[in-house]
């Protein structure tokens, strides 16, 4: 039978599962731990003091915890401050905790101390360098000075020149005694171990403003914008270059050591990039605004005032035109133009046209044409209707004919025709 | 017919100075680039000094430069070399030359010369 | 200075046989923006120089079809096909690739 139905084993209302080997297992409620759920859970009460993380655990059928410390706090439920977060040890020694709650440093070789601050000067104890190397002390170590024939850092080998070779810069090392060497060098380089790199630019060859700057066994002129080529003796055609040299529609010239723009007019500069200020010598006449354009300015007018240059009275000012024309001013002499509406005419638009007059009758089908101010009307005869009379009436419209007669749409009249057995001018 | 006409050649003195004249005809003299070029008798050929179109730009080669002065007057059609502290071996006949374009330098009219003897 | 050396220096040529001047220059021609400037000039006897090729192997307008340059980099010669006896003179080369400009020493070229 299941090991859960056979009376729960759970304690404490813990929750009984059959795992997959088909043993019992307890889940436990807040509080409880152990196999059975039988032993209080020793975190239920927060024994880790601040920020500690509590983990519980059984041993030998105990409950036991134990708290996972935040940074700057040590001891068994994390109240003790831990004396290593200020970093009391110096140069890079490892710090612990001793029994006693205080730091312990572990010292690096060469130092020593409590905070292995002290300098342990180990020329003092005994004697490090060999075949009569001086001993000097330099902060957490110490270095040997060799006599001559001896090398490495206890003086402990004799000396071979060329090995390692001194020679820098790929220059080849020939010994030349028994301790000394001869460095022959690179082209290029110079001094005892090549490490001199040769300065090239003395009588150097850059041209036109070239600029030398040193390589190695060579140099390289840095040419001004105008030239180019190794020495800077070729001239470099502007012209040529993308984008192009001369701005705005302006021709390039090419030039020896630099190139030339003629402007397109309204344009000038260098590279004809500056717009030329018409307005500099433009003549708009006193509280006129003056604009400059490409080549050419506008001024605009204060009111009361037009012309090119502003300095003609506004003629329209004074509205010398009818009322609807339209006043504009000759900007060569000031004066009004009046644009009539229709219907008027005359320089001032107050004189009436007589549509009735001028050409043909503006009224169809014989209408008869009346003259009103800044128009005209029509007088429509039987039949028409319409501003000039052009539409026949559909007599029709009304429905005039009874007893589901045809209605014929006649010019001012209309007839019907009746169904059999009626009649009547409506079949009525 | 475009023509170059140089004139003010003739013997100086060691130290003296000397003004060449070329009188362009029959094209647009502003138009173009110029140089004056010297051959010493017997010799080759030695470039002396260039002249932009509009005057703006010049050069000289180290044998002539802070001595020699290339100048032109366009409304007059006429290139200039102004020419001090004259040496025996300035000795040359003086031609000037139109440069056909600006990109590629070479000469496609020169002058018939005028000689310059500089002789104690 | 770019040094442009000329070969030979004389040449005795019999009417209607080919000639040819070799230049050579101290230091390329070939100009950084792409062109080469190396040009020929022939100077008459008693006459002002005159343009017969520009730029390797252009001819000039007026320049008979029997002349013709060639070459690259530093080496350039002139050919003329058919001598003919109003080609007398001296023939120079000239580069304006490098300032300054300089020219050949020059060749002489006489009819046998």
């Known amino acids: 039978a299941p090991p859960c139905l056979d009376g729960s084993p759970c304690a404490n209302g813990g929750r009984c599962t059959q795992l997959p080997s088909r043993e019992a297992a307890c889940l436990c409620p807040p509080g409880w731990v152990g196999e059975r759920c039988q032993l209080e859970d020793p975190c239920h009460s927060g024994p880790c003091a601040g920020r500690g993380v509590c983990q519980s655990s059984v041993v030998a059928g105990t409950a036991r915890f134990s708290c996972r410390c935040p940074r700057g706090f040590r001891g068994p439920d994390c109240s003790l401050p831990d004396p290593c977060l200020s970093s009391p040890c110096a140069h890079g020694a490892r710090c612990s905790v001793g029994p006693d709650g205080r730091f312990l440093c572990s010292c690096p070789p060469g130092y020593q101390g409590r905070s292995c601050r002290s300098d342990v000067d180990e020329c003092r104890v005994g004697e490090p360098c060999r075949h009569g190397g001086t001993c000097l002390n330099t902060p957490g170590s110490f270095r040997c000075q060799c006599p001559a024939g001896y090398t490495g850092p206890l003086c402990e080998n004799p000396a071979v020149p060329c090995a390692p070779s001194p020679c820098r810069n790929g220059g080849t090392c020939r010994q030349s005694g028994d301790l000394t060497y001869d460095c022959a060098c690179l082209p290029g380089f110079e001094g005892q171990n090549c490490e001199v790199n040769v300065d090239d630019c003395p009588g150097h060859r850059c041209l036109n403003g070239g600029t030398c700057v040193d390589g190695v066994n060579t140099y390289n002129c840095q040419c001004p914008p105008e030239w180019t080529g190794q020495f800077c003796t070729e001239d470099v055609d502007e012209c040529q270059l993308q984008p192009n040299a001369c701005h705005n529609g302006g021709t390039c010239f090419n030039t020896l050591g630099g190139h030339s723009c003629v402007c397109v007019n309204g344009w000038t500069g260098e590279s004809c990039s500056q717009n030329i200020d018409d307005c500099a010598t433009a003549v708009c006449f006193h509280g006129a605004t003056c604009h400059d354009r490409v080549a050419s300015f506008y001024c605009a007018c204060p009111m009361g005032k037009t012309g090119l240059l502003c300095h003609l009275d506004d003629a329209c000012v004074s509205n010398p035109c009818h009322e609807d024309a339209i006043c504009d001013t000759n900007p060569v002499n000031g004066r009004a133009i009046c644009t009539c509406p229709p219907g008027f005419t005359g320089g001032a638009c107050d004189q009436d046209v007589d549509e009735c007059s001028i050409g043909a009758n503006p009224c169809e089908h014989l209408g008869r044409c009346v003259n009103t101010q800044g128009s005209f009307l029509c007088q429509c005869g039987r039949g028409y209707t319409g501003p000039r009379c052009e539409t026949d009436v559909n007599e029709c419209l009304s429905g005039p004919c009874r007893n589901q007669a045809t209605c014929l749409d006649r010019i001012g009249q209309f007839t019907c025709i009746c169904m059999a057995g009626f009649t009547g001018t409506y079949c009525e | 017919e475009v023509q170059l006409l140089e004139s003010g050649g003739g013997l100086v003195q060691p130290g003296g100075s000397l003004r060449l004249s070329c009188a362009a005809s029959g094209f647009t003299f502003s138009n173009y680039d110029m140089s004056w070029v010297r051959q010493a008798p017997g010799k080759g050929l030695e470039w002396v000094s260039y002249i932009s179109r509009g005057g703006g730009s010049t050069y000289y080669p180290d044998s002539v430069k802070g001595r020699f002065t290339i100048s032109r007057d366009n409304s007059k059609n006429t290139l200039y070399l102004q020419m001090n502290s004259l040496r025996a071996e300035d000795t040359a006949v003086y031609y000037c030359?139109?440069?056909?374009?600006?990109?590629?330098?070479?000469?496609?009219?020169w002058g018939q010369g005028t000689m310059v003897t500089v002789s104690s | 200075d770019v040094v442009m050396t000329q070969t030979p220096l004389s040449l005795s040529v019999t009417p209607g046989q080919p000639a040819s001047i070799s230049c050579r220059s101290s230091q390329s021609l070939v100009h950084t923006q792409g062109n080469t400037y190396l040009h020929w000039y022939l100077q008459k006897p008693g006459q002002s120089p005159q343009l017969l090729i520009y730029?390797?192997?252009n001819r000039f307008s007026g320049v008979p079809d029997r002349f013709s340059g060639s070459g690259s980099g530093t080496d350039f010669t002139l050919k003329i096909s058919r001598v003919e006896a109003e080609d007398v003179g001296v023939y120079f080369c000239?580069?304006?690739?490098?300032?300054?400009?300089?020219f050949g020493q020059g060749t002489k070229v006489e009819i046998k």
């Open positions: 000239s580069q304006s690739t490098h300032v300054p400009w300089t």
């Open positions: 030359g139109r440069h056909a374009t600006t990109a590629y330098w070479y000469f496609d009219v």
């Open positions: 730029k390797v192997s």
